[in-house]
């Protein structure tokens, strides 16, 4: 989580970069454009961000507001169980895979899907207004 | 409309090699994992092999292991299955799938199918 | 490697019949489970996923089900295109299995 400040009731909020979306705490980027999972993770790190690592369901409602039908690729893969990127359990939600190639995660405005991670698809990046601090 | 039509079928005499093509349309052929299924005649349904959206996972059953190579080419929109040290019991329709996106290995999707007859 | 068994092999029956196909699975594969319907001369059709979900366009008078071991495919009123035989597949992992089939004919 980003440390430092309670973003919601400090006087001037940090402020996301150009064409990322401010949503209480954090910074989200939504493509426009198709990746496959690996290249997704390469463009949101070399924006000093990550592939959304959703934290709670309340998080997850929130930003489906904001996705269709069509998936995201999001920090989740399974790796001997679903984790997030940061280590943690996919603990507040179902994800199951339908074949031995369905390892990362992905979301639309209906929930969370497992694929093959070599589909391109779009993605959100996560990260904090201070690209010094945490990234989950 | 998804279209998925083999070719390349026809006789060969044992420990001969075949090459099957499929021709795919009317989807994105390069977001969908790709599939060889056969059926040798009055049988059953026998996987044959499938290949990854990039090509480079292939998968296959002991029985053509080491004998018949799946590969792909996603800018012809193309599937290919190249079948080598060909036996009698190959002997069989080979249909071209694919599967129901996402890398769900099911055949959602299937050709019309083309016919090997390995025969002296 | 995993098994699928169905059973009859065969089976006669007339329009407007209820009708059950059973596979089985040598493990437990969960719900990694498809239905396929195929009449002579022609390619496969597939008709069902995870055993229960229905393909697009598949009529509802097809359903499946069971988990772990044990599934069905039940028709609920026999009409005439559905003389064909009918296949079950694994579809988790390699190898993809199919069941050896299940001809259903007009009684």
């Known amino acids: 989580l980003c440390q430092g400040s309670n973003y919601s009731t400090c006087a001037s909020c940090p402020s996301c970069p150009d064409r990322w979306m401010k949503y209480g705490n954090h910074c989200y980027y939504f493509s426009v454009e198709e990746k496959d999972w690996n290249s997704s993770l390469e463009f949101c790190l070399a924006r000093d961000s990550h592939l959304l690592v959703i934290t709670d369901n309340q998080e997850m409602s929130l930003l489906q507001v904001f996705l269709s039908e069509a998936f995201c690729w999001i920090g989740l893969r399974n790796n001997s169980g679903w984790r997030w990127e940061d280590g943690s359990p996919l603990n507040f939600s179902r994800i199951s895979s339908n074949s031995f190639v369905q390892t990362c995660g992905a979301i639309n405005k209906n929930g969370l899907q497992a694929s093959s991670c070599e589909v391109p698809l779009h993605w959100v990046c996560k990260k904090c207004p201070f690209a010094d601090q945490a990234l989950f | 409309e998804v279209q998925l039509v083999e070719s390349g079928g026809g006789l060969v005499k044992p420990g001969g090699s075949l090459r099957l093509s499929c021709a795919a349309s009317g989807f994105t052929f390069s977001r969908y994992y790709m599939s060889w299924v056969r059926q040798a005649p009055g049988k059953g349904l026998e996987w044959v092999a499938t290949?990854?959206?990039?090509?480079?996972?292939?998968y296959y059953p002991d029985s053509v292991k080491g004998r018949f190579t799946i590969s792909r080419d996603n800018a012809k929109n193309t599937l290919y299955l190249q079948m080598s040290s060909l036996r009698a019991e190959d002997t069989a329709v080979y249909y071209c799938a694919r599967e129901g996106g996402y890398g769900n290995l099911w055949f959602a999707y299937w050709g019309q199918g083309t016919l090997v007859t390995v025969s002296s | 490697d995993i098994q699928m068994t169905q059973s009859p092999s065969s089976l006669s029956a007339s329009v407007g019949d209820r009708v059950t196909i059973t596979c089985r699975a040598s493990?437990?594969?969960?719900?990694?489970l498809a239905w396929y319907q195929q009449k002579p001369g022609k390619a496969p059709k597939f008709l069902i996923h995870n055993v229960k979900t229905l393909a697009e366009g598949v009529p509802s008078r097809f359903s499946g089900s069971g988990s772990g071991t044990d599934f069905t495919l039940t028709i609920s009123s026999l009409q005439p295109e559905d003389f064909a035989t009918y296949y079950c597949q694994y579809h988790y992992g390699i190898p993809f299995t199919f069941g050896q089939g299940t001809k259903l004919e007009i009684k």
């Open positions: 493990e437990n594969i969960y719900s990694a």
């Open positions: 290949i990854s959206i990039s090509g480079g996972n292939t």
